[in-house]
């Protein structure tokens, strides 16, 4: 979380951001509030990125104002229009690329005053794997799979009942470059599987950690997933 | 005796939402995961998803994905199935079957007519 | 997804008769397999899990075999009861399937 108030001639405002990351190809959110106003004709948002040379986004009187808005942003990027009156500054960025990252600024300008904060925004992939169970030539493995990475993550497995195993010499893990070149399909072999366990795939960069859980037992199968972005930071 | 009673029969139109309930006894409802599957007139079994009522994860089959809402009341040991955009392909016989699918409820049958 | 196809889709027998369903699953699925029964406007039952475990309360002339990719569902000697649809279904891999059913009428 990173708050930052204003400094010169006006009053200051507090203004506050928080660190997030943006999965490529998909549609991200910066995140930033402020101190509101009663009047939307008197906020300016102005997001601007550290070196690039134009803005990122600009909202004045009550409208986007995009003529010195820069190339790489053109078509890309919206604020929501309603909420700036109760605050909320945050930018929709359409369709992340790997060149989004970087440190952006969020700058308000109210009737109250000015201030800034700024945000780190890290770009990358990450997807929810899933275990299912393989069968061939008579063994059972686990499958682990997800569909896109990157930067290329590390892959564990552990087991509930044989807390601590290291399982690395009983899986092989591989990564599938995807046709756009840049993201990769992780996919994890668990050999040398026992019934009545809980395996967990755990598939993590320095972006997010995403977990992919398996349950066997004779009568069913219980599988459930989840992702968590890293360095959530406010500022 | 675990009994899964569900909701009566269902006549909709296209374009609209159906919600069919499934209400749980004789066991721990939260200790088991409640499944969703369909039966199209004269067609075979096809699996829409899973619940677990202990915390609402959810499984979806990716066919309904987008399209069916899977919910559960714990207070009143009940689960949930809404299906959304309803086309006239949705007519069939919707059950609810106790994970590890051993305990089925009677059906529900859901008619989508315009 | 796993297809699962089950043969006969119909069958015509007698009481005492022993009859046999297959079910073909298109990748292996270990044991991952259950096999129910329906009939007309009541709750379907389970049969058998896990390939060969028979649900508590079914009766013993019903077997489940296989292993993989091949099962078979084995009723020993066919009772007046037993006349109904039979199907299979996987659950070693999301989203489950089933098989499309096996019609057991009387002859």
């Known amino acids: 979380l990173i708050i930052g108030f204003g400094i010169s001639g006006r009053h200051s405002i507090t203004v506050t951001t928080v660190a997030s990351a943006g999965n490529i190809g998909e549609d991200g959110i910066l995140s930033c509030t402020f101190e509101p106003d009663i009047k939307l004709s008197d906020i300016v948002i102005q997001w601007l990125k550290e070196g690039v040379l134009g803005l990122v986004h600009e909202f004045k009187e009550g409208k986007d104002e995009l003529s010195e808005q820069d190339e790489m942003f053109r078509g890309r990027t919206a604020v929501f229009a309603d909420q700036v009156i109760v605050g909320n500054a945050s930018l929709r960025l359409k369709n992340v690329q790997l060149t989004d990252a970087g440190t952006y600024k969020c700058y308000i300008i109210t009737s109250k005053g000015k201030g800034n904060a700024n945000l780190e925004y890290k770009t990358g992939a990450f997807s929810m794997p899933e275990v299912n169970v393989d069968y061939n030539a008579s063994s059972e493995t686990l499958r682990c799979e997800a569909p896109r990475w990157f930067p290329q993550p590390t892959v564990v497995w552990a087991s509930q009942v044989d807390q601590g195993a290291n399982f690395s010499e009983v899986s092989n893990t591989s990564f599938e470059l995807n046709s756009e070149n840049v993201t990769m399909k992780v996919v994890s072999v668990l050999y040398n599987v026992t019934i009545n366990n809980t395996y967990s795939c755990m598939i993590e960069n320095d972006i997010a950690k995403a977990t992919g859980d398996i349950k066997v037992t004779e009568s069913e199968i219980k599988r459930r997933s989840h992702l968590q972005l890293l360095n959530s930071k406010a500022s | 005796e675990v009994q899964l009673v569900q909701s009566g029969a269902e006549v909709k139109k296209p374009g609209s939402s159906v919600k069919v309930s499934c209400k749980a006894s004789?066991?721990?409802?939260?200790?088991?995961?409640m499944h969703w599957v369909r039966q199209a007139p004269g067609q075979g079994l096809e699996w829409m998803g899973e619940?677990?009522?202990?915390?609402?994860?959810?499984n979806y089959n990716q066919k309904f994905k987008g399209r069916v809402t899977l919910t559960v009341d714990k207070s009143t040991s009940t689960a949930y199935m809404e299906l959304s955009s309803l086309r006239s392909e949705d007519t069939a016989v919707y059950y609810c079957a106790r994970g590890p699918r051993d305990y089925w409820g009677q059906g529900t049958t859901v008619t989508v007519s315009s | 997804d796993i297809q699962m196809t089950q043969s006969p889709s119909s069958l015509s027998a007698s009481v005492g008769d022993r009859v046999t369903i297959t079910c073909s699953a298109s990748?292996?699925?270990?044991?991952?397999l259950n096999w129910y029964q329906q009939k007309p406007g009541k709750a379907v039952k389970l049969l058998i899990y896990?390939?060969?475990r028979l649900h508590s309360g079914v009766p013993s002339r019903f077997s489940g075999s296989g292993s993989g990719t091949d099962f078979t569902l084995t009723i020993s000697s066919l009772q007046p009861e037993d006349f109904a649809t039979y199907y299979c279904?996987?659950?070693?891999?999301?989203?489950?399937?089933f098989g499309g059913g096996t019609k057991v009428e009387i002859k």
């Open positions: 990748q292996g699925i270990s044991n991952y």
């Open positions: 279904q996987q659950y070693s891999k999301l989203p489950y399937t």
């Open positions: 896990y390939t060969s």
């Open positions: 619940i677990d009522p202990s915390d609402s994860y959810i």
């Open positions: 004789g066991y721990t409802f939260t200790s088991y995961w």
